[in-house]
């Protein structure tokens, strides 16, 4: 069966939107009005992995781009990157480990934990216009909570 996907945007709990910053990086900043069109639209795919009521394994691709968020070790540190893939082969039900995030729903907020690096989360900074990154702390200065807005295909 083909993998099930939906299109969405994400905003952090401070209402910052995610936009492209160069070819292989996302940044978070406040957008208003027509600028909202700059925000990236994700194709969220529901992939194979350990699942529970509040935890669902997903892959986060950029809609109509052959780019996926992936988590790899760089200089011994878990790192978030945008990785290009062959569009003929993706998305797929069995994604490589580095592409898988556990989408965790808590109090109407979403967290995205790396399946490859447990307790590391997609994060944004309090500051404006900073890169989206993989953070190893929750409940500190950095933001790990998001809301999801559905986008029609």
């Amino acid at each position: 069966a083909p993998v099930r996907s939906l299109n969405c945007t994400l905003r952090d709990s401070q209402q910052k939107s995610l936009v492209m910053s160069g070819p292989y990086e996302l940044k978070a900043l406040h957008l208003q009005g027509q600028d909202m069109e700059q925000q990236v639209v994700f194709s969220m795919s529901f992939v194979q992995g350990e699942e529970s009521n509040d935890k669902i394994p997903v892959a986060l691709g950029l809609k109509e781009k052959n780019l996926y968020l992936s988590c790899v070790l760089k200089d011994d540190k878990p790192t978030l990157q945008l990785e290009s893939v062959d569009p003929k082969n993706y998305p797929k039900k069995k994604m490589e480990k580095r592409f898988v995030f556990n989408k965790i729903e808590i109090n109407n907020k979403l967290e995205f934990e790396s399946a490859q690096f447990p307790n590391w989360y997609i994060s944004t900074s309090q500051a404006e216009n900073m890169p989206v990154f993989l953070g190893g702390t929750k409940g500190g200065q950095d933001i790990t909570d998001f809301t999801m807005q559905f986008v029609s295909s």
């Epitope: 992995g49 350990e50 790899v72 070790l73 990785e83 290009s84 893939v85 062959d86 082969n89 069995k94 490589e96 480990k97 580095r98 399946a115 490859q116 690096f117 447990p118």
Partner: antibody, heavy 120, light 107 residues
Framework: QVQLVESGGGVVQPGRSLRLSCAFS??????????VGWIRQAPGKGLEWVAH???????SYADSVKGRFTISKDNSKNTVYLQMNSLRAEDTAVYFC????????????WGQGTLVTVSS | DIQMTQSTSSLSASVGDRVTITCRAS??????LSWYQQKPGKAVKLLIY???KLHSGVPSRFSGSGSGTDYTLTISSLQQEDFATYFC?????????FGQGTKLEIK
């Protein structure tokens, strides 16, 4: 230091089953990011990745063995298994187990291998 | 599946020679490439990972380079113990695939 030792190989008839074991020491397969794979080498041929299991139980298989082979682990025994059913002549090979950490995989430590011969 | 091609199946060289072994992927593998050495009766050894990173304990005469689809293993000055078979492995996409191997023989 890390050691991996394969066992369970032998001569088996086509269609029959065999279970290989990979006993390891020097690391724990409950450590996050850890993985063990099975790789085989047919006589006089190159290496072929067969199956892999991550610390969290996530499994992957080569198309050539999907539905016939099953990889599993027993953390308390520090052992990874490869259950091979419906064996075919083309499964004849030396089977190695190897350890990696994280995806993308680099197989850091390898066992010496165990020979499986499928023949009537 | 991604095909990995080591176009030279065997290579003759002498001690002290500089040797390069190549591996070509059927698509871009994002530098997710490792190199292995195999000797008869010995455990396979990891030499290079992530295209160019030298695994601990591997002599510095071994080096790796490449990007996209084309990758190279170089031995700067061949030693007696380097005569072996060398394999590349791509980790970009499941199923992970090896090259067919290049056997390095004494000239």
């Amino acid at each position: 230091q890390v050691q991996l030792v394969e066992s369970g190989g032998g001569v088996v008839q086509p269609g029959r089953s065999l279970r290989l074991s990979c006993a390891f020491s020097g690391f724990s397969l409950s450590t996050s990011g850890m993985g063990v794979g099975w790789i085989r080498q047919a006589p006089g041929k190159g290496l072929e990745w067969v199956a892999h299991i991550w610390w969290d139980g996530d499994e992957s298989y080569a198309d050539s063995v999907k539905g016939r082979f099953t990889i599993s682990k027993d953390n308390s025994k520090n052992t990874v298994y490869l259950q091979m059913n419906s064996l075919r002549a083309e499964d004849t090979a030396v089977y190695f187990c190897a350890r990696n950490r994280y995806d993308p995989p680099w197989f850091v430590d390898w066992g010496q291998g165990t020979l499986v011969t499928v023949s009537s | 599946d991604i095909q990995m091609t080591q176009s030279t199946s065997s290579l003759s060289a002498s001690v002290g020679d500089r040797v390069t072994i190549t591996c070509r992927a059927s698509q871009d593998i994002s530098n997710y490439l490792s190199w292995y050495q195999q000797k008869p009766g010995k455990a396979v050894k990891l030499l290079i990972y992530y295209t160019s990173k030298l695994h601990s304990g591997v002599p510095s005469r071994f080096s790796g380079s490449g990007s996209g689809t084309d990758y190279t293993l170089t031995i700067s000055s061949l030693q007696q113990e380097d005569f072996a078979t060398y394999f590349c492995l791509q980790g970009k996409m499941l199923p992970w695939t090896f090259g067919q191997g290049t056997k390095l023989e004494i000239k």
